[in-house]
Amino acid sequence: ESLGTEQRVVGRAAEVPGPEPGQQEQLVFGSGDAVELSCPPPGGGPMGPTVWVKDGTGLVPSERVLVGPQRLQVLNASHEDSGAYSCRQRLTQRVLCHFSVRVTDAPSSGDDEDGEDEAEDTGVDTGAPYWTRPERMDKKLLAVPAANTVRFRCPAAGNPTPSISWLKNGREFRGEHRIGGIKLRHQQWSLVMESVVPSDRGNYTCVVENKFGSIRQTYTLDVLERSPHRPILQAGLPANQTAVLGSDVEFHCKVYSDAQPHIQWLKHVEVNGSKVGPDGTPYVTVLKSWISESVEADVRLRLANVSERDGGEYLCRATNFIGVAEKAFWLSVHGPRAAEEELVEADEAGSVYAGEQKLISEEDLGGEQKLISEEDLHHHHHH
């Protein structure tokens, strides 16, 4: 089904957003304290593998940073440890818990050099800047058709109230640097560029700082020119995944195409023990196939209750009248051996189709792969 232009989907670094987690916890620690964050499994069920993330970046365990599936400890905390922390499911990147951590120490008398911050002090504990909605800060890539308008936002808080400045490709960015200028709204923590052109492509960084610390976020802007081109698949998506037997897996594939693309999820399969046909082209089966009416489509393939036979190589393929783009990726399924399971059947959402998929001829798709139906696959599995 097409997404339509009402929905604009953008690159979220392999994240599948789950249901909105509960209220973000605001935690304040003193300098030198041990920061301890706890994230019990929702509903008391099994947790599965998790990853801890700070300001959008995965935390690497060290002597000071102790990472467990349900608990994170940061020893001897300093101002640099302030920020937005989240615990996520490793496979789906779903946010299970998130915390806003501020590490403070009471400023000594005479600490204010210019006195200007005193007026801003709210009486709340002083602290370094932090993102007010960290779960909205994960998206990094914005691809926009030329002549449209772009807005980057970095809403933050801190005490004293932080300032915000903007860089383009690592250098100070001011209005005179682009035709048409820029519009800044400090109270909205935003930068607006109207009627973007290809020369606006680049990396845009917001730097939010006060005297206790600084945080930054970098966005990549791509400006799509309206000359017809074959579909573009976002770099890095979909990504290889490892799944536990019986778990659910979701893959993203981000497609940009001015001309309506035919989008497919395919899986490499074996027929009579062979992965390729007599002419050397790989066998693939169509899992999902549709025409997208959207210039941008964030397409997803959901595999429920995966078994070992779901492991293997998958393809996201987008075809328009100009050409084909495709991305291959792997799913590895591991865990205790379960009884042989039948192929995953289509769920109500129609994530995986079996048997009744209309197949497109090799000529239509450039003849790169042999297409076989799930019925054929059943046949070959059982013979």
Partner: antibody, heavy 127, light 107 residues
């Protein structure tokens, strides 16, 4: 200079059809969208639908879905509003407007802004 | 659909007056709100987009503010050419919806 000129309005009987045209000039037609907005006599504005000419992607208001079709001919820099099964309540001045998007990673939608409008063409549905 | 309610429906003012029009959305529309001005028999003209950004070429006496559900259009010093009907419009949700309009008349 950006210009949008609507044509094709007139009197039509209930159940009849009409095709409106919107000729665009002064900007790159394929870079932005074209929206149709209507205004019944003495009433406010009502959004009808939108097309992005390069992709052919369209959206419609529920009140016209299935009866109205928006299309575009990029070689002629012209958008069209095909109106079928017309009703008395479709009587209005129909405007086309250049439409651009405000793209913002922080939110899950695109804000659409109509910055240049045509002069409008009157459609009267009456027996 | 998201309902947009403007108030007042009409107002009388004099040249030089400060005029404020409000627009309330039935649900949160963030800052996705535009203001348009329309004179009788003419097409609407864009004044403000994204709640507070002045469209190019629009006089600085016009300003917009607000976010979420409550928005304001302010004309700091009313000029003769400002007597018109003003519409707010949201586009976070489908379909885009307009307020019913506020008519600004000469006192």
């Amino acid at each position: 200079e950006v210009q949008l000129v609507e044509s094709g309005g007139g009197l039509v009987q209930p159940g009849g059809s009409l095709r409106l045209s919107c000729a665009a000039s002064g900007f790159t037609f394929t870079s932005t969208g074209i929206s149709w907005v209507r205004q019944a006599p003495g009433k406010g504005l009502e959004w009808v639908g939108r097309i992005y000419p390069t992709s052919g992607s369209t959206n419609y208001a529920d009140s016209v879905k299935g009866r109205f079709t928006i299309s575009a001919d990029t070689s002629k820099n012209t958008a069209y509003l095909q109106m079928n099964s017309l009703r008395a309540e479709d009587t209005a001045v129909y405007y086309c407007a250049r439409t651009y998007g405000i793209y913002d990673l922080y939110v899950d939608y695109t804000e659409y802004v109509m910055d240049y409008w045509g002069q409008g063409t009157l459609v009267t549905v009456s027996s | 659909d998201i309902q947009m309610t403007q108030s007042p429906s009409s107002l009388s003012a004099s040249v030089g007056d400060r005029v404020t029009i409000t627009c309330r959305a039935s649900q949160d529309v963030d800052t996705s709100l535009a203001w348009y001005k329309q004179k009788p028999g003419k097409a609407p003209k864009l004044l403000i987009y994204s709640a507070s950004f002045l469209y190019s070429g629009v006089p600085s006496r016009f300003s917009g503010s607000g976010s979420g559900t409550d928005f304001t259009l302010t004309i700091s010093s009313l000029q003769p050419e400002d007597f018109a009907t003003y519409y707010c419009q949201q586009s976070t949700g489908h379909p885009q919806t307009f307020g019913q309009g506020t008519k600004v008349e000469i006192k």
